[in-house]
């Protein structure tokens, strides 16, 4: 059962598995949620103890019964992990804590104009986990406006002290705000020879990378595959770091793979969710339960529903015994990874999907693309919305994209002449316009946020956000698309599609069925040559065939230019403007979403 409330002046007795320091009970709850075993916690505030070294302690707890005895204790705050909850969980913490100093290894000191600038510096520094900033009221003259960047082995402070006239906070890497580059390549036959900070067992290099991305100290990794000659090191995932943030030495070794943490683009990749099945493989660990079930999918479901289960091994039924039911071994370990991985055992293993909700919903795999044809099928573009106006009569106005459970991203030019959000209706999960009847449910718009530098589509800043009056429940036919990562600035997208109900030629009408077209991106230099009378800025992105024939058109405005990269769809562009539709040597011009990620996050996370 999901319990989100905090219990004031209550201490949970026993079950301690770890003690960390957190600046608030709310943050303690997030740390507990991300810990592989924590189900409950007790946080000690300032008033709970005479001993300042005990302030801000967050005791992580586990219990076989999922509950612990409650004891009254002044100043203590207790609660439950969000593991039992179905809602999205984010590690992002934008809070700034006044008059607190989070302790760690202070490795960089520089002047900053504000706490915000200090936080940005931490976010853009590969090693930084949190920071402390001395305000201009700080007693020591030389320390005023000093920004201290800090890190620890665990990513959490080693202590928290009261200190007047300072503020402290965390890196915003997990909020998608880092400008650090993301190196997504996995290098085969490569060993990184830097120091190991930890090692775990993993079934493949991609799980190893996800573990590295989730581990606060890991900057890169080396994975020894099942074919690695040294048996004791097979399936070993070595988590690594270095002072420079890059591997100092790369050694060519076959059957090893190496790669980098994706910490600065983790919002657009699954980090916690290991959804694959590993055939002919046993995961060893502490056994929680053994249940007879039919098939490995049922076993995974069972593991996902058991809050303490971290991974499982399914032993298929022998012949026709036990009604075809095999044995489902539910397991756990201290770090969430198998203690050993055995191959050739006939078992099928995998991980709980309970952690998938810690990843951004936008990373969820969707139905495979239907190749050929121009009409879409249901669930193919689950982020695409149709925006209707009811004035003077109801009609399709523009497209848009779901980017959050209360947010639609679209084009600013759609709102020319729109006096009030009251006349707007957002329809989600729609394939055919004909589905929309009087009684079809829609989302009202609470607020239209147009970029304050927008004047007209052709001059850029053609971007707007719609805040919905109610939140969207995600399903297979309605879910968000990932924003591009600032760390992916150099990615070349090759699988891009434009979708919408717009005209199919210049003088036409709105289409009934959602249309799709695969369109190649065009460089800005090339695009500028095609539009000599306009300024194609870096805040625009162009797409189209040289010979024309496929393009966005009237009615597609505000809709997505969606590109698939590493199995995840990204909202690369917003349909904005162009000369005619699908004309030869006249590519479509789209708002370059990457350039507006900060603006989007600022508005949606305000």
């Amino acid at each position: 059962e999901c319990v989100t409330r905090l219990f004031k002046d209550i201490h949970f007795e026993g079950g301690d598995i770890a003690t960390v320091f957190t600046p608030s009970a709310k943050h303690c709850q997030v740390v507990c949620t991300h810990h592989p075993r924590c189900l409950l916690f007790t946080f000690t505030g300032e008033s709970a103890s005479e001993d300042p070294t005990q302030w801000f302690t967050c005791v992580l707890k586990d219990s076989v019964t999922e509950t612990l005895p409650r004891v009254n204790r002044t100043g203590a705050i207790s609660g439950y992990s969000f593991k039992q909850c179905s809602h999205q969980i984010s590690a992002c913490n934008k809070d700034i804590y006044v008059d607190l100093d989070m302790k760690g290894i202070n490795y960089n000191s520089s002047l900053a104009k504000s706490a915000q600038e200090c936080q940005e510096r931490c976010t853009d520094d590969i090693h930084c986990h949190f920071f402390t900033y001395a305000t201009r009221q700080f007693p020591s003259l030389e320390h005023r406006n000093i920004c201290l960047l800090k890190h620890t082995q665990t990513g959490t402070p080693t202590g928290i002290m009261k200190l007047d006239k300072v503020v402290t906070g965390f890196s915003l890497k997990s909020c998608a705000l880092s400008n650090l580059a993301c190196i997504r390549d996995v290098f085969p036959n490569t060993v990184f020879a830097d120091s190991n900070i930890d090692s775990v067992m993993a079934p493949d290099a991609f799980v190893c990378r996800r573990i590295c991305t989730h581990h606060p100290g890991c900057l890169f990794f080396t994975f020894f595959s099942q074919e690695w000659p040294k048996e004791s090191q097979r399936n070993l995932c070595l988590l690594k770091t270095s002072e420079s943030g890059l591997p100092s030495t790369r050694i060519k070794k076959s059957k090893a793979l190496s790669g980098f943490s994706l910490q600065s683009c983790r919002h657009s990749i699954p980090v916690f969710c290991h959804s694959s099945f590993y055939h002919d493989t046993d995961f060893l660990g502490e056994e929680l339960d053994i249940v007879a079930v039919k098939g490995h999918e049922a076993c995974q479901k069972l593991c996902t529903n058991a809050v303490r289960c971290q991974f499982f091994t399914y032993a298929p039924a022998q012949a026709s015994c036990n009604e075809g039911k095999g044995k489902c071994y539910l397991k756990l370990s201290s770090n969430g990874s198998p203690t050993k991985i055995l191959r050739g055992t006939g078992g099928i293993s995998g991980y709980t999907l309970r952690l998938c909700k810690m990843d951004n919903e936008c990373t969820t795999k969707i139905k495979p693309r239907i190749v050929g044809g121009t009409a879409s099928v249901r669930g193919e573009w689950p982020w695409q919305v149709t925006l209707h106006t009811t004035s003077p009569t109801q009609r399709h106005l523009c497209g848009g994209s779901i980017i959050g459970n209360q947010w639609i991203l679209t084009a600013a030019h759609c709102f020319y002449g729109v006096e009030s959000p009251k006349i707007l209706r957002v329809y989600i999960g729609i394939l055919n316009q004909s589905e929309i009847k009087e009684d079809t449910s829609f989302f009202g718009v609470q607020e239209i946020i147009i970029h304050d530098q927008y004047k007209m589509a052709e001059s850029g800043y053609d971007i707007a956000l719609l805040k919905l009056e109610t939140t969207v429940n995600y399903t297979d036919s309605q879910r968000p698309i990932c924003l591009p990562s600032k760390g992916d600035r150099n990615v070349i997208y090759t699988d891009c599609w434009v979708t919408g109900w717009g005209y199919r030629k210049l003088r036409d009408k709105i289409q009934n069925t959602l249309q799709k077209a695969k369109i190649p991106l065009v460089t800005n230099d090339e695009c500028q040559k095609r539009y000599r009378g306009h300024k194609i800025t870096h805040k625009m992105i162009c797409a189209g065939y040289r010979e024309g024939g496929k393009d966005a058109c009237k009615g597609d405005s505000g809709g997505p230019l969606s590109c698939k990269h590493n199995e995840v769809w990204h909202l690369v562009g917003i349909t904005s403007w162009g000369e005619g539709c699908a004309q030869r040597e006249r590519p479509g011009v789209y708002t370059n979403v990457l350039e507006y990620v900060d603006w989007i996050l600022e508005k949606t996370q305000a």
Epitope: S109, T132, A134, F138, P139, S140, L141, E142, H143, L148
Partner: antibody
Framework: EVQLVQSGAEVKKPGASVKVSCKAS????????MHWVRQAPGQGLEWMGI????????SYAQKFQGRVTMTRDTSTSTVYMELSSLRSEDTAVYYC?????????????????WGQGTTVTVSS | EIVMTQSPATLSVSPGERATLSCRAS??????LAWYQQKPGQAPRLLIY???TRATGIPARFSGSGSGTEFTLTISSLQSEDFAVYYC?????????FGGGTKVEIK
Amino acid sequence: EVQLVQSGAEVKKPGASVKVSCKASGYTFTSYSMHWVRQAPGQGLEWMGIINPSGGSTSYAQKFQGRVTMTRDTSTSTVYMELSSLRSEDTAVYYCARGAYLLELYYYYGMDVWGQGTTVTVSS
Amino acid sequence: EIVMTQSPATLSVSPGERATLSCRASQSVSSNLAWYQQKPGQAPRLLIYGASTRATGIPARFSGSGSGTEFTLTISSLQSEDFAVYYCQQFNDWPLTFGGGTKVEIK
């Protein structure tokens, strides 16, 4: 042993420039600020400015603004103080002095380590 | 800028006696004050920081007190090596400023 070793005495003509060096050893150079203080013959101490060796940021006393430049070379753990447009009243002993430890926040500190001083004589 | 005024300019004391040196700031410097000792031909040496905290290796006979605008350095029992010039310095605002110094001489 923590020490600051300064360059040797200089004799300069009015209008010229002088560059005094101060080499630090025995501690992490980039973790502490560095001050420059001068003392004219028979006079008191006068603060000239400060440099943060980590980022290289500086702050100068108004009196020396436009004439003084403080720099650092992290590879050799050395700070430099250059004073231009010298006049006879710049004749003094110039000291470098270690200031606050910048990797820790604490309320109070002083200049705890001083160089031996560099005598600069300005005379035509 | 903050002006630091030391008094007396010269203090004549016999060895073994107590010496009290004063330093006044033109505006409050809180406790951001340091004291230095300087002997002829030598660089200054830090004695006290934060108005009252002794620097490493400084004998207990040296003590500092005061806050705001009025500060005192006390040498409880003067030793022969204590005869020198003493400077106060404020660390509360730029530019840093020193007092004019108090010369402690043998009576």
